[in-house]
Amino acid sequence: QDCSAQCQCAAEAAPHCPAGVSLVLDGCGCCRVCAKQLGELCTERDPCDPHKGLFCDFGSPANRKIGVCTAKDGAPCVFGGSVYRSGESFQSSCKYQCTCLDGAVGCVPLCSMDVRLPSPDCPFPRRVKLPGKCCEEWVCDEPKDRTAVGPALAAYRLEDTFGPDPTMMRANCLVQTTEWSACSKTCGMGISTRVTNDNTFCRLEKQSRLCMVRPCEADLEENIKKGKKCIRTPKIAKPVKFELSGCTSVKTYRAKFCGVCTDGRCCTPHRTTTLPVEFKCPDGEIMKKNMMFIKTCACHYNCPGDNDIFESLYYRKMYGDMAHHHHHH
């Protein structure tokens, strides 16, 4: 970095840094910048956070332009508003035991992450937070006609199905299912969720599905016809295979995606359906995931703000998929 030139800062005022990020002078001593954090790329202009014992590791001398923020041996850690010495162990909450090591915090769970499979003694296991207990514990939702000690009671064994009749369970259940949330990514593979109690025990559960509003690599603006400002549902030239964490969909899909606008409007899915997609991984493992498929898109000015976690209701909702109840227990 040549610091001989006159100082030129991007903005008059000092930038506003996120909580826990230091405001420091750049490598030339010119401008105040937000310090880069552990593992982030750094340059002499964009220095690492010195208050956390970080330095810009440029690697071999040949590559002196871009480095990675690395902790000095024995660097402290900042975690949850507290500073911990390297080697110091602490409980971040009753659920996790953490250790600071050279600027990095590693935590291990103190609560059992055990899974409970259904059995006659516990047909509907679920984890709940019990008063006065830190860790969630397993409880068994049970029919009212169960014995105090376990399944063995011949008089109640006449029915073919164990436990209450599901139709009876549903009789006094007001079934409610929210709309699917907007896709977590504006391009590429994301997640969409909803909450429903449309199950045997009328219990609220969160369902999720994969979603892709549009591929990230597509340059959709090129396809907008002259005089038009939007392309709502661009034609996909060829069938595509979806990718998820290195796994590829077994089948190819001629999927619809949403387009883009040049007038500030957003195009988002309007009517969708949910279908299972099988992904094959490099190790041969096959996993089945529910995925959103777009039927129609809508272009509108009701766009989410960059940092708005409470995105507008219109944007959040997708319609036409209420009939597809894919349960994820």
């Epitope: 059992s112 055990d114 899974v115 409970r116 499979l117 259904p118 059995s119 006659p120 003694d121 516990c122 047909p123 296991p125 514990e137 397993w138 014995t147 105090a148 000690v149 376990g150 399944p151 063995a152 011949a154 064994r157 073919d160 199905t161 164990f162």
Partner: antibody
């Protein structure tokens, strides 16, 4: 970490009572039931019985008259008692956790011989 | 006496698909039989793969799936791996007791 460990004498005399203990760690026997299963040499698995999380028991009818499964919640231990044993009771005995028989002990070999 | 029957042995090629079944002598297997599938690899302890017909244990790969097929409990392995070679037992619940099947020896060729 969930673990089950069977223990008890490896040799029992005919007509005597076979007594085995399953010591559990990583979960509570007041939350999960524990099953006893055995396997004769070169053969399949035979379910003996279970003590459910709240203390109730169910047994294989073939053992009903001579089997007792009990537990000591304070020690997180489950015990199996099989009376009037014969050479036909020579087998590897396993305890396993209820809920998909997900976790098993390594098994303990019991030989019935005079 | 209730008898639970499994295929004594099955052979499959790596990458192939195979279905192990578990038949009840007293009628169709239903969800109230809480079908369980247990695996034993040579020299290793038993471990449960599937419980309650179709619920996978945390360590069970997604290529293993439990279901009911034609009145029988079924364990389907898709994209079989060499390490899937093992003995597989099913266990069915009959209101007062469990009954284990005789086991299926799965051989993976190659």
């Amino acid at each position: 970490e969930v673990q089950l460990q069977e223990s008890g004498p490896g040799l029992v005399k005919p007509s005597q009572t076979l007594s085995l203990t399953c010591t559990v760690s990583g979960f509570s026997i007041s939350t999960f039931g524990v099953h006893w299963i055995r396997q004769h040499p070169g053969k399949g698995l035979e379910w003996i019985g279970v003590i459910w999380r709240r203390g109730g028991t169910d047994y294989n009818a073939a053992f009903m008259s001579r089997v007792t499964i009990s537990k000591d919640t304070s020690k997180n231990q489950v015990s199996l008692k099989l009376s009037s044993v014969t050479a036909a009771d020579t087998a590897v005995y396993y305890c396993a956790r209820d809920g998909g028989f997900d976790y098993w002990g390594q098994g303990t070999t019991v030989t019935v011989s005079s | 006496e209730t008898v639970v029957t499994q295929e004594p042995s099955l052979t499959v090629s790596p990458g192939g698909t195979v279905t192990l079944t578990c038949r009840s002598s007293i009628g169709a297997v239903t969800t109230s039989n809480y079908a369980n599938w247990v695996q034993q690899k040579p020299g290793q302890a038993f471990r449960g793969l599937i419980g309650g017909t179709s619920n996978r244990a945390p360590w069970t790969p997604a290529r293993f799936s439990g279901s009911l097929l034609g009145g029988k409990a079924a364990l389907t392995l898709s994209g079989v791996q060499p390490e899937d070679e093992a003995e597989y037992y099913c266990a069915l619940w009959y209101s007062t007791h469990y009954v284990f099947g005789g086991g299926t020896k799965l051989t993976v060729l190659g």
